[in-house]
Interface confidence: medium
């Protein structure tokens, strides 16, 4: 806490300028004038003020704002973005994108702070959902803010918001993040011809039920097995030896390779050892000829 | 089918602005990614930057902020990028493009030349 | 950023003869995202390969694409006449896209 002393003769500042920058803590504390600092927050970031007099101007729009800043101050914060603690951010309500840009390009270049979570957090909410103009914005700053939200907060991304989504946007999502997205990239692309619309819907194809590998097997599509590796186990089980060749086409030699990790591990265990052996690659561990095949799922469900 | 029509050539002093435009056709503009690249004669192709116009939302190649700046309007469907502060540097083709998964479609290309 | 790097930048080719030309990308591109261009003097960027392997539309059969990871080509089995031209590879997987500077093919 800064103590309140008289400003000296002459030194009140009639404007944010440079000169401000000779001023010790205590008369920066005493001249300047919070309002006029308010009105002229834009010229803060040309000076090339201390840490130590920034925490004092911050201290000023604090007295002048306690229930938190007006927009009209928060987007020319500036480097004085970074003297915020998330209590400071959550009194705010930032409604203007231009706000979010101006205060994440002062954040550019490091990892997503506390500060900047709970900054895009309050911008979020404010709009209601995730729109396109919001996320187009927020992936460009950090490509993984996609991957960070949790499947109920994906829920409010609109499908049309996924052509703004880029293949590096979803390098870290999880397969429950994928089921989300999934249906709602499948909308967006509908109207692509086949070959564009597999390498759009590729990135989002961990969240990708069976019945869409087996149609997606149909089109000629040549899977590489970076993104087979990466589909539900589930969803690639009950697909036959025949539409996994189709589906990787001339991939498919991939196979021996990924043989002990899932879901390729768990997909041999359930096909017939005649029909990998048609493939032609030496995988093993298929149900032996002549083993009745059952299934306890259909048996359990109709006990 | 799809085309992209571009506006014709322009010769414009240094320091001026120029408005390229690219009009759309025979397919939905809002839906797919309007690229800008820029080719100066000899030299290879450069991303300028994107435009999505159903949004509006827009991606820069950070060589090119400041300098390149990306509209669009969906009733003509016609997408439009203005160059500031021009200097010989940006003498060039300028080519838009539609992007889905690739750069599928390309303009004919625009012209600009930039001399006193 | 990701940087391409093609060579040779220029080659020049006999009719008939087997072309191979190389795209280097500086980090790792998933081989969905690596296309190739054909340019003609005059004529805007056709394009000529995508997701690495499949040939676009009108494409001969001779020309055909390769690779993974950081690196790729493009081939044709038996050059002929229509071929030259300079061919760009390009990335569409993290942004800003680039493109590669090109390969000029020449007849020889």
């Known amino acids: 806490e800064v103590e309140k002393t008289a400003c000296p003769s002459g030194k009140k500042a009639p404007e944010i300028d440079e000169s401000l920058i000779f001023y010790k803590k205590w008369e920066l504390e005493a001249c300047v004038d919070a309002a006029l600092l308010a009105t002229q927050m834009d010229r803060v970031n040309a000076i090339p003020f201390t840490y130590e007099q920034l925490d004092v101007l911050k201290h000023k729009l604090d007295e002048l704002y306690p229930q938190g800043y007006p927009e009209s101050v928060i987007q020319h914060l500036g480097y004085l973005f970074l003297k915020m603690s998330p209590e400071d951010i959550r009194k705010w309500n930032v409604t203007s994108l231009e706000t979010l840009k101006a205060l994440l390009e002062v954040n550019k270049g490091h990892e997503m702070s506390p500060q900047v979570a709970t900054l895009i957090d309050r911008f979020v909410k404010g709009r209601g959902q995730l729109d396109k103009d919001t996320l187009d914005t927020l992936t460009a700053f950090y490509p993984g803010y996609l991957c960070s939200l949790s499947p109920e907060e994906l829920s409010s991304v609109p499908p049309s918001s996924i052509w703004a989504v880029r293949p590096q946007d979803l390098d870290t999502c999880d397969p429950r993040q994928l089921d989300v997205l999934y249906p709602k990239a499948r909308l967006a692309f509908q109207n692509m011809n086949g070959s564009e619309y597999f390498v759009k819907i590729q990135s989002f194809l961990g969240g990708a039920p069976t019945e869409d590998l087996k149609a997606l097997s149909q089109q000629n599509v040549s899977m590489d097995l970076a993104t087979f590796m990466k589909l539900r186990t589930d969803a690639v089980l009950p697909l036959t030896v025949a539409e996994v060749q189709k589906l990787l086409g001339p991939h498919v030699e991939g196979l021996k390779a990924e043989e002990r990790h899932r879901p390729v591990r768990d997909w041999i265990l359930r096909q017939r050892q005649d029909d990998l052996d048609t493939l032609g690659l030496g995988l093993q561990g298929g149900i032996p000829n002549g083993y009745l095949v059952l299934d306890l799922s259909m048996q359990e469900a109709l006990s | 089918q799809v085309q992209l029509q571009q506006s014709g050539a322009e010769l414009m002093k240094p320091g001026a602005s120029v408005k390229l435009s690219c009009k759309a056709t025979?397919?939905?503009?809002?839906?797919?990614?309007i690229e800008w690249v820029k080719q100066r004669p000899g030299h290879g192709l450069e991303w300028i930057g994107e435009i999505l116009p159903g949004s509006g939302s827009t991606n820069y190649n950070e060589k090119f902020k400041g300098k390149a700046t990306f509209t669009a309007d969906t009733s003509s469907n016609t997408a439009y990028m203005q160059l500031s502060s021009l200097t010989t540097e940006d003498s060039a083709i300028y080519y838009c493009?539609?992007?889905?998964?690739?750069?599928?479609?390309w303009g004919q290309g625009t012209l600009v030349t930039v001399s006193a | 950023q990701i940087v391409l790097t093609q060579s040779p930048a220029i080659m020049s080719a006999s009719l008939g003869e087997r072309v191979t030309m190389t795209c280097t990308a500086s980090s790792s591109v998933s081989s969905s995202y690596l296309h190739w261009y054909q340019q003609k003097p005059g004529s805007s960027p056709k394009l000529w390969t995508y997701s690495t392997s499949n040939l676009a539309s009108g494409v001969p059969a001779r020309f055909s694409g390769s690779g993974s990871g950081t690196s790729y080509s493009l081939t044709i089995s038996s050059m002929e006449a229509e071929d030259a031209a300079t061919y760009y590879c390009h990335q569409y997987h993290r942004s800003p896209w680039t493109f590669g500077g090109g390969t000029k093919l020449e007849i020889k």
């Open positions: 493009a539609r992007a889905g998964a690739w750069f599928a479609y």
């Open positions: 025979g397919y939905t503009f809002t839906g797919y990614w």
